[in-house]
Interface confidence: medium
């Protein structure tokens, strides 16, 4: 399923993007899944749809639930699901794990902390930043556009950082906060030729006709923050975006993990409703960085049904 978790705090603005992407010209319809009730587009409503965006201005705990978005084009429809949870504000300083965005890692050279999800909002500088609930003060901290820069990073700078900004909608202001952990790496990073962990070269993946299938391309690129690292899929040597088969999509956004200190990325290729012709395609997992490119090829084969003869 094309599903995405989103969360926010009551009485704050929350804006959610449909997990299924489409051209700006495509219409997007939103529904509350439990009741199949259409979300209005009129901005006078507290919760309303605006193209690919679903806006809670402000959010209430009762808004929690699964929302369906349908991207409609002249030739196809794509359905996505937004799993929205609105939490009550905490009285104490601690930010619970379920409100935390992905952890970012920094070093003496690179100490940017991006404010999560801010690109979805209509905000104006400056951002306010807090560490462990204390407002950041001092010349070492610089709020720059949508991120915080910390000069001369030290291990003591590790902790939970909260950004606070104001979303403006038709003259009305709504507060938004987002928190993520920041860890400090002392070791010197390095970059190496990409190593693809999965899939294996020339792997054959068994799939069932009519079912959905996922292929994951995972690669590691060195230690520490990588200036350039990417993984992606190609079909028969063609970019997914150019191949023109709406059933086959790359998962938007790449997960960066530091397994054993290594900087690794993965990209999932989702094939909906596998068809016979999909078995004829060549699926290439590509990993590239400043050193160059490595490619592992996967092919699909039909999974034989289990023989139930006694």
């Amino acid at each position: 399923k094309f599903s995405k978790q989103s969360w926010g705090l009551e009485n704050e603005a929350l804006i959610v993007r449909c997990p299924r992407q489409g051209k700006p010209s495509y219409t997007v319809d939103w529904y509350y899944s439990q009741t199949n009730k259409s979300i209005p587009t009129q901005e006078r409503n507290r919760v309303f749809a605006s193209g690919q965006l679903l806006k809670f201005l402000p959010a209430a705990v009762a808004d929690s639930g699964i929302y369906t978005c349908i991207v409609r084009s002249p030739t196809f429809n794509r359905t996505g699901y937004a799993n929205v949870t609105i939490y009550k504000k905490q009285s104490d300083c601690n930010v619970p794990d379920y409100l935390m965005y992905s952890t970012v890692s920094g070093s003496e050279k690179n100490s940017k902390i991006y404010c999560p999800t801010i690109d979805l909002y209509n905000w104006t500088a400056p951002l306010e930043w807090f560490k462990n609930c204390q407002a950041l003060q001092g010349s070492r901290y610089r709020a720059h556009k949508s991120f915080l820069v910390i000069d001369n990073v030290m291990t003591e700078d590790a902790g939970d950082y909260t950004c606070k900004f104001i979303h403006n909608e038709n003259g009305a202001n709504y507060s938004v906060t987002a928190t993520r952990s920041f860890t400090v790496k002392d070791e010197q990073g390095f970059s190496l030729f990409p190593v693809i962990g999965a899939p294996a070269q020339n792997e054959i993946k068994e799939v069932e006709i009519g079912k959905n299938a996922n292929l994951t391309c995972s690669a590691c690129f060195g230690k520490g923050t990588q200036f350039l690292a990417a993984v992606l899929w190609q079909l028969n040597g063609t970019k997914i975006t150019d191949f023109g088969e709406p059933r086959i999509q790359q998962e938007e956004g790449q997960n960066q993990s530091f397994s054993n200190g290594l900087a690794c990325l993965d990209m999932v290729l989702r094939i909906a409703d596998v068809k016979e012709e999909d078995l004829l395609l060549q699926y290439d997992c590509l990993a590239l960085n400043l050193h160059g490119l490595r490619r592992h090829t996967v092919r699909l084969s039909r999974k034989n049904p289990i023989d139930h003869h006694s």
């Epitope: 030729f193 070269q201 990417a230 992606l232 190609q234 028969n236 040597g237 063609t238 970019k239 975006t241 150019d242 060549q282 290439d284 590509l286 590239l288 400043l290 050193h291 160059g292 490119l293 490595r294 490619r295 592992h296 090829t297």
Partner: nanobody
Framework: EVQLVESGGGLVQPGGSLRLSCAAS????????MGWFRQAPGKEREMVAV???????KYADSVKGRFTISADNSKNTAYLQMNSLKPEDTAVYYC???????????????WGQGTLVTVSS
């Protein structure tokens, strides 16, 4: 083999603009990543901007907000629009690419010959 040919370099005053082009030709070329690097006299070659899979862009901190990389797939061409140029942008600018021949398991970057950009009053 892929040939990359840069054009558009020249002399420009501080605060001015230039647009570099990089045309890829040779074997059937489907660029996975195209980028611009630069090398100033006495310095190491550094990455300026790259465009991955025709949609994801990355920039060096020193050029963010001033330079824009783009690509035209139909022409196998990458562009670098350089605005608000500074004297420290003076360098030889190289186009580089990684292409997509399906038989390749690992490929080094292909490089152009470079085009000189001089920012001076």
């Amino acid at each position: 083999e892929v040939q990359l040919v840069e054009s558009g370099g020249g002399l420009v005053q501080p605060g001015g603009s230039l647009r570099l082009s990089c045309a890829a030709s040779g074997r059937t070329f489907s660029s996975i990543v195209m980028g611009w690097f630069r090398q100033a006299p006495g310095k190491e070659r550094e990455m300026v901007a790259v465009i991955i899979d025709s949609r994801t862009t990355k920039y060096a901190d020193s050029v963010k907000g001033r330079f824009t990389i783009s690509a035209d797939n139909s022409k196998n061409t990458a562009y670098l629009q350089m605005n608000s140029l500074k004297p420290e942008d003076t360098a030889v600018y190289y186009c580089a690419a990684v292409g997509g021949a399906t038989t390749v398991t690992a490929s080094e970057w292909d490089w152009g010959q470079g085009t000189l950009v001089t920012v001076s009053s």
